[in-house]
């Protein structure tokens, strides 16, 4: 049967009975081998039944004395089997054995849960020699026990290559409950049930769990650890904790905040990073995410022109990197821009609207209805056209660029002319006779040169020929026009 000592028990006497050889209690030890600095124990547990033989490992010495009497089996004397004490208290326990003097170099080692205890443990071995035997007492002390000191302690002694092992001494350190799992902060959907877990251990067991929500007890009758609380849903933020109770008292977990997921706040600080004729690069600072990660954002763009039809263009983008290039915009136009972002709950309101403008661009279309004819009397080529639609000028017209290419007998030369924005005609001198002249015209703004019109060709004959009909831009889909006289 296990003997059990509680911390309230009186210390056992150091030597409850005489060791073989009539060891006196006032006998001073011949040798004391401290393994660590001295310690005054609050409790001392010593052998209680020194006379009873050990039931475990026993070494039977092969050597006999001078009188040839066989030596008795060597065994550790029985001691207290179970020590229960509170955390931070001190404890001392020991093993004792009587060894015939014929054995030299006997050492005792301490083991806990199958591992040898080495290093700076408070272990002291004392030797009490007598005529025939030496009483050896190995003491082990712990000044302030912790849970990690819980376990089964044994002594081992090697003698004649035989190992003698003591009965185990079970140390049970009791204290307040210790949490192995505490509730964790969560972000939850409104009115949706969720679980919280709390687990605590002793000893002593059992450990009972109370749940607390916003400082009110959820369960008046505790549950045994571990406990899972199903919270039926929340409409507003709440703080939860759990209380773990055992016979030593109670421990309270950390309080955790459970937040209710909501739609995000609108983005702030929408700003223009860069503008071109047809695009605007914007950035924004996201608002509060409503305890739920942003999924994506929506950029809303509407023309600021009061005469516009007020339609809104919507561009969807990922929530990161809080940057978006709005494309397909008109040049030299004013826009109102707002940003909204969404999480799993829904869309935020739109950010404050900001005004942004695109810059001038090069015209997007060429001049229309280009016609070319030869004025032989003045030796000029007359060119006429219609200016591109205002909407597609993408800026203020500053003029036109005329390209005329002269091809004759394997020779080709291109000339460029710039003309002002007023008017829609030009006259260029004939450069080569008996040649083909190819004319193209592009509109020009401060934003650049637009596309050239389709080429219009006219044949310039040798001197002395008559006036000829004009050549003009073909209808779409026709081959390059050429006027052959």
């Amino acid at each position: 049967a296990i003997t059990e000592a509680r911390e309230e028990a009186k210390p056992y006497p150091l030597f409850p009975g005489p060791f073989p050889g009539s060891l006196q209690t006032d006998h001073t030890p011949l040798l004391s081998l401290p393994h660590a600095s001295g310690y005054q124990p609050a409790l001392m547990f010593s052998p209680t039944q020194p006379g009873r033989p050990h039931t475990g490992n026993v070494a039977i010495p092969q050597v006999t004395s001078v009188e040839s009497k066989p030596l008795p089996p060597l065994a550790f004397k029985h001691t207290v089997g179970h020590i229960i004490l509170s955390e931070h208290k001190g404890v001392k326990f020991n093993c004792s054995i009587s060894v015939p003097n014929i054995y030299q170099d006997t050492t005792i080692s301490w083991w806990k849960d199958g591992k040898e205890l080495l290093g700076a443990h408070h272990a002291i071995t004392q030797f009490y020699p007598d005529d025939e035997v030496t009483a050896i007492i190995a003491s082990f002390s712990i000044t302030s026990v912790q849970r990690s000191d819980n376990g089964s302690y044994i002594c081992k002694m090697k003698i004649n290559n035989e190992e003698i092992v003591s009965d185990p001494i079970y140390i049970e350190v009791q204290g307040l409950p210790h949490f192995t799992k505490q509730p964790e902060s969560m972000n939850v959907t409104r009115n949706t049930a969720f679980n919280l877990t709390c687990q605590a251990v002793g000893p002593p067991e059992p450990v009972n769990i109370f749940w607390v929500q916003n400082s009110s007890r959820v369960n008046e009758q505790p549950e045994k650890s571990p406990s899972v609380l199903t919270v039926p849903g929340l409409t507003e933020m709440a703080v939860f904790s759990c209380e773990a109770h055992n016979d030593k008292g109670l421990t309270v977990s950390k309080g955790v905040q459970i937040n209710i997921k909501a739609i995000p706040s609108p983005p702030t600080e929408v700003s223009i990073r860069n503008s071109t004729a047809h695009s605007i690069l914007i950035s924004w600072v996201p608002g509060f995410d409503g305890y739920s990660p942003f999924r994506n954002c929506s950029i809303q763009v509407k023309e600021a022109d009061p005469l516009s039809n007020g339609s809104v263009m919507i561009f969807n983008t990922s929530a990161l990197p809080h940057l978006y290039q709005i494309k397909q915009l008109q040049a030299l136009a004013n826009y109102s821009i707002g940003v909204s972002c969404m999480n799993e709950i829904g869309w935020s309101a739109v950010s404050p609207w900001i005004l942004a403008s695109t810059t001038e661009g090069a015209p997007s279309v060429a001049p229309l209805n280009v016609t070319v004819f030869l004025n032989e009397s003045s030796d000029n080529v007359d060119i006429r056209w219609m200016k591109p639609p205002t909407k597609q000028q993408d800026g203020e017209l500053v003029g036109y660029r005329i390209s005329h290419v002269w091809q004759s007998a394997g020779i080709s030369k291109e000339l460029l002319e710039e003309v002002g924005q007023n008017g829609s005609r030009a006259r260029i001198s004939v450069q080569v006779h008996n040649a083909t002249c190819t004319v193209r015209i592009a509109a020009v703004t401060r934003g650049g040169v637009g596309p050239f019109s389709d080429p219009v060709k006219i044949f310039i004959p040798a001197h002395g020929w008559v006036d000829y009909a004009p050549s003009s831009t073909p209808a779409p889909g026709n081959a390059d026009p050429v006027l052959i006289i």
């Epitope: 009115n191 929500q213 916003n214 007890r217 959820v218 369960n219 008046e220 009758q221 505790p222 039926p232």
Partner: antibody, heavy 118, light 106 residues
Framework: QIQLVQSGPELKKPGETVKISCKAS????????MNWVKQAPGKGLKWMGW????????TYAEEFKGRFAFSLETSASTAYLQINNLKNEDTATYFC???????????WGAGTTVTVSS | QIVLSQSPAILSASPGEKVTMTCRAS?????MHWYQQKPGSSPKPWIY???NLASGVPARFSGSGSGTSYSLTISRVEAEDAATYYC?????????FGGGTKLEIK
Amino acid sequence: QIQLVQSGPELKKPGETVKISCKASGYTFTNYGMNWVKQAPGKGLKWMGWINTNTGEPTYAEEFKGRFAFSLETSASTAYLQINNLKNEDTATYFCARYYNYWYFDVWGAGTTVTVSS
Amino acid sequence: QIVLSQSPAILSASPGEKVTMTCRASSSVSYMHWYQQKPGSSPKPWIYATSNLASGVPARFSGSGSGTSYSLTISRVEAEDAATYYCQQWSSKPPTFGGGTKLEIK
């Protein structure tokens, strides 16, 4: 299935004592607290208190301290309500109700009617 | 202790009508439970923790609210809904019940 079966109606004289029972079945009796609720004729519900079925510790609402006693017979999964020194105003139906988290009474007995009349 | 006031005390409705009864608390509560009681019977758990229907409760019932104001709504009243409905708070001890709303069907 889970149920709470209460003892039958009682007719008592003022000053007498009554003890009514509530037998639980279909669940582990000691895992849930047991509550007692009073309903006077034509009136609403009034929580009287509860008993911890694990420890046997009773808790009484202020109005029901003194003459009222909750007790258990755990081996029989039964809770008891005893009213001493009965008064006319104790005439009511008394319900036992199983306690779930958040003071939610998820299972109710059918009620025991106690009539106090001289 | 928290006092719960239910209104109206008596509610009369025709089948198919939508009805709402309210429960006001003298101070803020976290959850409100609701029970249905018919004459001669024990109360039945009806709505748990503000908005969760108890087992077997028809989906035409719903509960909502927060703080000091809670309500039970029946989207289309049926004859079998005639009963007294009690609210009961969880937030602070002791648990308290409202005085009840009696629903009559015309």
